[in-house]
């Protein structure tokens, strides 16, 4: 009996009610592998999800997030609201980054500007809500024979952002 079921191709299921005949998957269902005893219900892309690929008898539907949202999780299982650069998402909506913090993405959270002085450098370009500061060379970097070693990771002071 098991052998009969294993002959059922993708897009069908092994119908126990009909002497294990291979029956086509009903509408809005699919089987992506052979030998299945049931077909899986197609994923529905609704609400903040939009359809990227329609369901077929052999493959599930694939979803994306609607405009203004971005995907999280495997196969875009979650959608999270976008914000503008210079903002972060809170429960009360998109909030501007606090002074001294920035976010250069449409998702994620604000983080503090680099503290140039912790690396013995000076601020070359001021930071904004959307961009980190640019640190200028320290006096030692400008002296003759100065090392051209790779600078360390940016030093930061702990900051906080609104919620």
């Amino acid at each position: 009996l098991q052998d009969l079921c294993s002959n059922c191709p993708a897009g069908t299921f092994c119908d126990n009610n009909r002497s294990q005949i291979c029956s086509p998957c009903p509408p809005n269902s699919f089987s992506s592998a052979g030998g299945q005893r049931t077909c899986d219900i197609c994923r529905q892309c609704k609400g903040v999800f939009k359809t990227r690929k329609e369901c077929s008898s052999t493959s599930n539907a694939e979803c994306d997030c609607i405009s203004g949202y971005h995907c999280l999780g495997a196969e875009c299982s979650m959608c999270e609201q976008d914000c503008k650069q210079g903002q972060e998402l809170t429960k009360k909506g998109c909030k501007d980054c606090c002074f001294g913090t920035f976010n250069d993405q449409k998702r994620g959270i604000c983080r503090p500007w680099t503290n140039c002085s912790l690396d013995g450098k000076s601020v070359l370009v001021n930071g904004t809500k959307e961009r980190d500061v640019v640190c200028g060379p320290s006096p030692a970097d400008l002296s003759p024979g100065a090392s051209s070693a790779t600078p360390p990771a940016p030093a930061r002071e702990p900051g906080h952002s609104p919620q």
Epitope: A74, S77, M78, K91, G108, I109, H160, Q163
Partner: antibody
Framework: QVQLVQSGAEVKKPGESLKISCKGS????????ISWVRQMPGKGLEWMGK????????NYSPSFQGQVTISADKSISTAYLQWSSLKASDTAMYYC?????????WGQGTLVTVSS | DIELTQPPSVSVAPGQTARISCSGD??????AHWYQQKPGQAPVVVIY???NRPSGIPERFSGSNSGNTATLTISGTQAEDEADYYC???????????FGGGTKLTVL
């Protein structure tokens, strides 16, 4: 597809140092936060801290500040968790996870055993 | 930083409704997320942003969050729902994430 693959299990003695890793693939590693989460044997999940690999900005839970160091090398899409001097109480499963609030992808975990 | 308190265990008969609470000062001001963890596995999101269910998570899972309590509700609980459940939140002040202590759900 997105994956976080962690380094293998470690057995260490108290006082030894250790650095475990979490390699991301299938997404823009530099622009997503990576968090580290501890789970002691038979206990719950504890958020340790996070790093933004793009510029290596880190932020620690007060409970773990000064106890561990989180770092990243964006050129090889890898985040690290390290100890300079392990204690028996550091014995736990350590997970890396993508995100800062919603942790949508998790590594398989690295079991760290510290015993004399 | 905010502390999240969960009951250590909850028991429910198959087909009945399980409710797992997560209490913390003004947790309703932040998003609450819920994770399911089965033995030997990494956690999985079952509810995000208070009440949203990821695709692939059964409709019997739902969530709410207001005041000092977030709640995960599992309607028509099934044996496969037996697991540990953790609430979590992210607080922008201090930029910290925190997990609740976890609740072991037993399906009798």
């Amino acid at each position: 597809q997105v994956q976080l693959v962690q380094s293998g299990a470690e057995v260490k003695k108290p006082g030894e140092s250790l650095k475990i890793s979490c390699k991301g693939s299938g997404y823009s590693f530099s622009t997503y936060w990576i968090s580290w989460v501890r789970q002691m044997p038979g206990k719950g999940l504890e958020w340790m801290g996070k790093i933004y690999p793009g510029d290596s900005y880190t932020n620690y839970s007060p409970s773990f500040q000064g106890q561990v160091t989180i770092s990243a090398d964006k050129s090889i899409s890898t985040a690290y968790l390290q100890w300079s001097s392990l204690k028996a109480s550091d014995t736990a499963m350590y997970y890396c996870a993508r995100g800062y609030g919603i942790f949508d992808y998790w590594g398989q975990g690295t079991l760290v055993t510290v015993s004399s | 930083d905010i502390e999240l308190t969960q009951p250590p265990s909850v028991s429910v008969a198959p087909g009945q409704t399980a409710r797992i609470s997560c209490s913390g000062d003004n947790i309703g001001d932040q998003y609450a997320h819920w994770y399911q963890q089965k033995p030997g596995q990494a956690p999985v999101v079952v509810i995000y942003q208070d009440k949203n269910r990821p695709s692939g998570i059964p409709e019997r899972f739902s969530g709410s969050n207001s005041g000092n309590t977030a709640t995960l509700t599992i309607s028509g609980t099934q044996a496969e729902d037996e697991a540990d459940y953790y609430c979590a939140t992210y607080t922008g002040f201090g930029s910290l994430a925190v997990f609740g202590g976890g609740t072991k759900l037993t399906v009798l």
